[in-house]
């Protein structure tokens, strides 16, 4: 299928102009190649009318042009002074006319309606409100005012000043007569329907002295806005329906083959299961506008979308709507999503998040998709280090391995951590990818004590047991803070031969703090990695207390118990500023842990890696 996309149908009136926008994948070849607009003939050939190389056919001379916008991957064809002869089938495309990199466009130019002299034309979108102004002379001020609709040769009364309202307009029309001195009355029609389209007649008084004014009401279906997005990318539908529906339930729906509209998401809590984990309806502003974000776009997401407002949370005639036509380009550089990452209860996951490799300096974020209500995605961590309070000690975002990938590590997993998470940046908003964390049966591979109390001024050893399958991995200990996990110095690089052979059931890498200081209190992680690729981690909390008994402490895994409920936090808690994407309302504001500053380090902390039997080994 061609990746070029444009409007399928364009309609206008004689004498008017049209502007036709066509989209293409903005590869360097596409950006520089010829763009064209051609008309399909009976023979099937497509005759060029205008091209980006400056060609304009004789019957377009002086009234048409083609402008390329390579940075956007679009080009625009403008045609003025339309005539009925311009109706027909066209193509906008790239390269040569017969190659197939094109999109079919149907243009229909109709004759403008023949209206009585002095007719006021009102052009309004379906669902909106129109105010028809009806002037009158002083002598007709006390007389009956009325609005009629002309249907063929007859006039049907719509409303009058004697409180008559035509049933077709019930609860959505009112006639206003201003105070004395103002010689004009108005008729306001709300929630316009397509059937309201037509010629109306205002009348004040009767007989030969009556005042009359014609009004032509054109009720338009909203022209769908064309949206061109990459496969696996992200789209945002911004929906502004007006203050009059600010307090009415909102929805986004997709038009199906039966021309009805299936709800995708609404503010009443309904959501299509096909969008699970990858859709958010942002809280609306005071003016009633809202937006819907869909990530991980699929080819089957293509189609016509409508947003609207109605108390039922679904499409109803006569309520305001906005329309989009979504095209999903399969020539995409964005990696597939969602991925599924598996972890075990008590264990950890290291999630590799893709981002646009051209945006290495962008801020990186990770948020938890919550399906309740309209969906939200509160930030959990960002590359500058802010972490939500309840994730203290178990979540970290690392810039490695870089070149289009960053890493998020989450440990101390519970079944509550299962769900969808989004990787995103403050750069290219199309690069929002979804990852699903699944908690599977099994035991964590790394074993550390759950809770350790260290004594000020003494020596502390914390063991971390790992299985043989990790013998070829690098082992490390680090001290967690909300800005990352600072690796602690190790005594030696590279495994010894005995270590590689791994003939024992278990191996050990131990952390030594000597002497223990107040600054050593906090979370420590034991982990394995391959270069900048991080694997499993295990966390242990170290509490520091005053000296009671002399001597050094060795904490054996047998003494492990649960990590403490009360975690010592800095009092300087601040709000996350929602810098993640262009629409800051996407994320709820969440509390974060302020930087605890001091790191364990220097020569006091050392990591010792050895077999269970040989505590004195010196390999990492």
């Amino acid at each position: 299928k061609s990746p070029v996309f444009g409007p399928q149908e364009v309609s206008s009136v004689e004498g008017n102009s049209v502007s036709i926008k066509c989209y293409y994948p903005p590869t360097s070849v596409n950006r520089h190649t010829r763009k064209y607009w051609c008309r399909k003939g009976a023979s099937g050939r497509c005759i060029t009318l205008v091209s980006s190389e400056g060609y304009v056919s004789s019957n377009y001379a002086g009234r048409a042009n083609l402008t390329n916008f390579p940075e956007n991957g679009t080009f625009v064809v403008n045609i003025a002074q339309l005539s009925r002869d311009d109706s027909g089938h066209y193509k906008c495309g790239l390269g040569i006319n017969s190659r197939g990199l094109s999109f079919d466009v149907s243009l229909e130019v109709s004759q403008g309606p023949e209206l009585p002299n002095g007719t006021e034309v009102y052009t309004v979108d379906v669902g909106r409100t129109v105010t028809i102004k009806c002037p009158f002379k002083t002598e007709n001020a006390p007389k009956t005012k009325a609005l009629y609709k002309k249907i063929g040769q007859t006039s049907v009364l719509v409303i009058d000043s004697r409180n008559y309202v035509n049933p077709n307009y019930k609860d959505r029309i009112r006639l206003r007569i201003p105070g004395t001195g103002q010689l004009i009355f108005t008729v306001v029609i709300d929630r316009l329907r397509l059937s309201d389209h037509g010629l109306y007649l205002c009348q004040a008084g009767d007989g030969s002295n009556r005042d009359e004014k014609n009004a032509d009401l054109q009720v338009l279906e909203p022209e769908p806005e064309l949206v061109y997005e990459d496969l696996r990318g992200s789209v945002t539908f911004h929906c502004a329906l007006g203050l009059e529906v600010a307090n009415v339930a909102k929805f986004l729906c997709r038009v199906n083959s039966r021309e009805t509209c299936d709800v995708v998401i609404n503010t009443l809590g309904k959501r299509d299961s096909a969008f699970e984990g990858r859709i958010l309806l942002n809280p609306q502003d005071k003016d009633g506008s809202f937006s819907v974000v869909i990530t991980g776009l699929r080819k089957e997401d293509e189609g016509r979308y409508l947003c609207g407002a109605h108390s039922d949370g679904q499409l109803q005639e006569g309520w305001p709507i906005q329309a989009w036509q979504l095209f999903v380009n399969e020539e995409s550089t964005i990696p597939r999503s969602p991925t599924v990452v598996k972890g075990v209860a008590g264990g950890s996951v290291a999630v590799l998040c893709p981002y646009n490799p051209k945006e290495s300096q962008s801020l990186k974020y990770w948020c938890l998709w919550e399906g309740a209500q309209n969906g939200r995605c509160p930030l959990l961590v960002e590359s500058q280090g802010l972490v939500q309070e309840q994730y203290e000690g178990r979540l970290s975002l690392l810039q490695e391995p870089g070149n289009g990938t960053f890493t998020v590590i989450l440990n101390q997993l519970t079944t509550q951590d299962a769900g969808f998470y989004w990787c995103l940046t403050n750069g290219d908003t199309r690069w929002r990818t979804t990852v699903e964390i699944k908690i599977i049966e099994g035991e964590p591979n790394l074993k550390v004590p759950g809770n350790v109390t260290a004594v000020l001024g003494e020596t502390l050893n914390i063991p971390c047991h790992f299985p043989c399958k990790f013998s070829s991995y690098e082992k490390y200990w680090c001290k967690w803070s909300n800005t990352g996990c600072q690796t602690l110095p190790s005594q030696d690089e590279g495994p010894s031969e005995a270590f590689v052979n791994c003939d024992e059931n278990s191996r050990l890498v131990s952390l030594t703090l000597n002497p223990v200081t107040r600054a050593d209190e906090g979370w420590y992680w034991c982990g394995v990695k391959q270069g900048h690729f991080y694997g499993e981690t295990a966390a242990v909390y170290v509490a520091v207390e005053e000296k009671k008994v002399a001597g050094s402490r060795y904490v054996s895994p047998a003494k492990a118990d649960a990590a403490p409920d009360e975690k010592v936090l800095d009092s300087g808690v601040r709000e996350i500023e929602n810098k993640a994407i262009q629409d800051p309302r996407l994320f709820a504001e969440e509390k974060v842990v302020a930087d605890t500053g001091d790191q364990a380090g220097g020569s006091r902390a050392s990591v010792d890696s050895s077999s269970s039997e040989e505590q004195g080994g010196s390999s990492k």
């Epitope: 972890g343 893709p354 391995p401 870089g402 499993e536």
Partner: nanobody, 116 residues
Framework: QVQLVESGGGLVQAGGSLRLSCAAS????????MGWFRQAPGKEREFAAV????????HYADSVKGRFTISRDNAKNTVYLQMNSLKPEDTAVYYC?????????WGQGTQVTVSS
């Protein structure tokens, strides 16, 4: 779900070359980091190489660095391991893995034998 099938193994003389392929089925191949591991008789499965979703970053075990090259073709849903200057100690079953640093999805493996 990702299914992985390795191929390209065989018998080769020391100093020779082989190219292993790992074909993935399942829509999400291109979003995963991919890795190669190997398991010699009587030993634990050990890490050999890893590559990110876009090939932007790679890493190799010290024992294969400079001799092995990992690459991928997302259009073909395939990851490769080019093995040059093979040594007898490279003899092992080679496994392909999706999401190699967590709980990986594994292939069935392909046997590589290097004779001296």
């Amino acid at each position: 779900q990702v299914q992985l099938v390795e191929s390209g193994g065989g018998l080769v003389q020391a100093g020779g070359s082989l190219r292993l392929s790992c074909a993935a089925s399942g829509r999400t191949f291109s979003s995963y980091a991919m890795g190669w591991f190997r398991q010699a008789p009587g030993k634990e499965r050990e890490f050999a190489a890893v590559i990110t979703w876009n090939g932007g970053s790679t890493h190799y075990a010290d024992s294969v660095k400079g001799r092995f090259t990992i690459s991928r073709d997302n259009a073909k849903n395939t990851v490769y391991l080019q093995m040059n200057s093979l040594k007898p100690e490279d003899t092992a079953v080679y496994y392909c893995a999706a999401d190699p640093m967590n709980s990986p999805y594994w292939g069935q493996g392909t046997q590589v034998t290097v004779s001296s």
